[in-house]
Interface confidence: low
């Protein structure tokens, strides 16, 4: 008698998460009598996935109806595909006995899920940075099968080439995760810059799923600092201004201090911003020079962002003021501009 | 913008049922799993389960098996919660909360929260 | 289930403090960990995921510590804006598991 052969003829299937996938198989002979059964992996540990006879397997159907006389398609389809269903199908035949005795097995059909990334999620650096610093970003997607995905950093449409990517497991698996690490040098012009993480795959039909973080979150621009001195006024008082510039963010908290002792504090707030997102603010302090027999070393102090202190010293020259004295001047600076380098 | 826009306050008596919707603006309901989570009074934050939006499948913590029903409808972008055979231990403002990742990997932790629905239960 | 121990269960601090809140998770949950804060009255809003990530658009004075079963939230400068209920969870593990949460009140 001919040989019995059970045919599978796919060798893989490939499906969408969600979808139906059909596993056909057929038999080229109604002899020996005994059932089908498909099971999922070979050997010992491999899983029963549907039984003819007994079991309940809510999921999975037959395609005909294999009740019929001579039916010899034993084709399933299996609903509602999850990534975990991904493995390899056997259709195997059985011999009638007690027990049934294994007779032959199909080639086995691979099934693959397609399973969409998750959307990019885009982290900053935990702690601000300066410019001409380099910060990372990381961007994580998760859940998609295959494994082939692409992704692409870009800062303001720009691709950026500082970048490492990671796609996990390295072997087979029901479906992978990727995380990938940019080095972003950042400039003084930042605050209003973004980073977008860029994620392609086949299950996205050519619609790249995106994630962004702003640098804004990522960069601190400490401030600049100028003292200058106007006039002096009939009162004998003199006007002193401290212009803080380009600082970003706002947070920033700014000290007078007479001869080292302290004579105001600001906060500063509600500070309009300049085009490049950065902020200005200006603070000035009168100080009645005929109080005075000796010079006056006034500072000018300057904390940003919780970051040490930046000072500009300079000392108003008590006995250089005449009651006509000129126009604007700037401060007499007996002091370095300490501005820290961060 | 994204959003999980919840229905209103409902107030019933025991035994009734109730269902809470919840609507995904600003992304794509199936792309993420969308939890529920129940607050009782004056206590902390309880896992209801989740629902797998692309599939369809739900999860249900211990608990809320048999009377709890999440459901889909991707047409109009919503997840519901249905209650039935309602108590007075039911009294709590329900939250839909949407999982930050896809299948499950970082899938636990929730970035965008419903602003909750008071279900009242009383005689 | 996994259980989820937060400490101090209740908090007075004053705006500009530097507030340090802690949970403990009664087994391994690697760094599957998630902060909300809840004001009442609302829901909560998501702060960190996976022990140390920060959402975008939360603000840098918060920040995430630890792994395994002890992590940590602090909140470098109190603003008033902060006081809240605080609460932790693992996703490490099914059922998804909250603490009862720490309450942060002004001083």
């Known amino acids: 008698e001919e040989e019995l052969q059970v045919i599978q003829p796919e060798k893989s299937v490939s499906v969408a998460a969600g979808d139906s996938a059909t596993l056909n198989c057929t038999v080229s002979s109604l002899i020996p009598v005994g059932p089908i059964q498909w099971f999922r992996g070979a050997g010992p540990g491999r899983e029963l996935i549907y039984n003819l006879k007994e079991g309940h397997f809510p999921r999975v159907t037959p395609v005909s109806d294999p009740t019929k006389r001579n039916n010899m398609d034993f084709s399933i389809r299996i609903s509602n595909i999850t990534p975990a269903d991904a493995g390899t199908y056997y259709c195997v035949k059985f011999r009638k006995g007690s027990p049934d005795v294994e007779l032959k097995s199909g080639a086995g059909t691979e099934l693959s899920v397609r399973a969409k990334p998750s959307a990019p999620v885009v982290s900053g650096p935990a702690v601000r940075a300066t410019a001409e610093h380099t910060v990372s970003f990381t961007c994580e997607s998760h859940g998609f099968s295959p494994r082939d995905i692409t992704l692409k950093w870009f800062k303001n449409g720009n691709e950026l080439s500082d970048v490492q990517t990671n796609v996990d497991p390295a072997g087979k698996s029901v479906s992978y995760s990727i995380r990938s690490t940019a080095r972003v040098v950042l400039t003084r012009r930042d605050v209003h810059s973004q980073v977008i993480c860029e994620v392609a795959h086949v299950t996205l039909q050519g619609d790249p799923l995106r994630g962004t973080a702003n640098l804004s979150e990522a960069i601190r621009v400490p401030p600049f600092l100028e003292v200058t001195q106007q006039s002096m006024r009939a009162d004998n008082q003199v006007n002193v201004t401290c212009q803080v510039t380009k600082f970003y963010p706002q947070r920033l908290q700014l000290t007078w201090l007479e001869n080292g002792n302290v004579s105001r504090t600001e906060m500063a707030s509600a500070l309009p911003e300049n085009k490049d997102g950065t902020y200005n603010w200006t603070s000035w302090l009168l100080v009645n020079v005929s109080a005075h027999r000796d010079d006056v070393k006034l500072t000018c102090q300057v904390e940003h962002d919780g970051q040490p202190a930046v000072n500009k010293s300079f000392s108003v020259k008590v006995s250089a003021h005449p009651k006509e004295q000129g126009s604007n001047t700037a401060a007499e600076n007996t002091g370095t501009n300490e501005r820290n380098i961060y | 913008q994204i959003q999980l826009v919840q229905s209103g306050s409902e107030l019933k008596k025991p035994g009734a049922s109730v269902k809470v919707s919840c609507r995904a603006r600003g992304y794509t309901l199936t792309d993420y799993a969308m939890n529920w989570v129940r607050q009782a009074p004056g206590q902390g934050l309880e896992w209801m389960g989740f629902i797998n939006t692309y599939t369809g499948e739900p999860t249900y913590a211990q608990g809320f098996k048999g009377r709890f029903v999440f459901s889909l409808d991707t047409s109009v972008s919503t997840a519901y919660l249905q209650i039935g055979s309602l108590k007075a231990e039911d009294t709590a403002v329900y939250y839909c909360?949407?999982?930050?990742?896809?299948?499950?990997?970082?899938?636990?932790?929730?970035?965008?929260w419903g602003q909750g629905t008071l279900v009242t239960v009383s005689s | 289930d996994i259980q989820m121990t937060q400490s101090p269960s209740s908090l007075s601090a004053s705006v500009g403090d530097r507030v340090t809140i802690t949970c403990r998770a009664s087994q391994n949950v690697g760094t599957h960990l998630a902060w909300y804060q809840q004001k009442p009255g609302k829901a909560p809003k998501s702060l960190i995921y996976?022990?140390?990530y920060r959402y975008i658009g939360v603000p840098s004075r918060f920040s995430g510590s630890g792994s395994g079963t002890d992590f940590t939230l602090t909140i470098s400068s109190l603003q008033p804006e902060d006081f809240a209920t605080y609460f932790c969870q693992q996703y490490n593990t099914y059922p998804l598991t909250f603490d009862q949460g720490t309450k942060l009140e002004i001083k």
């Open positions: 996976s022990a140390i």
């Open positions: 909360a949407r999982t930050r990742g896809y299948y499950d990997f970082d899938g636990g932790a929730f970035d965008y």
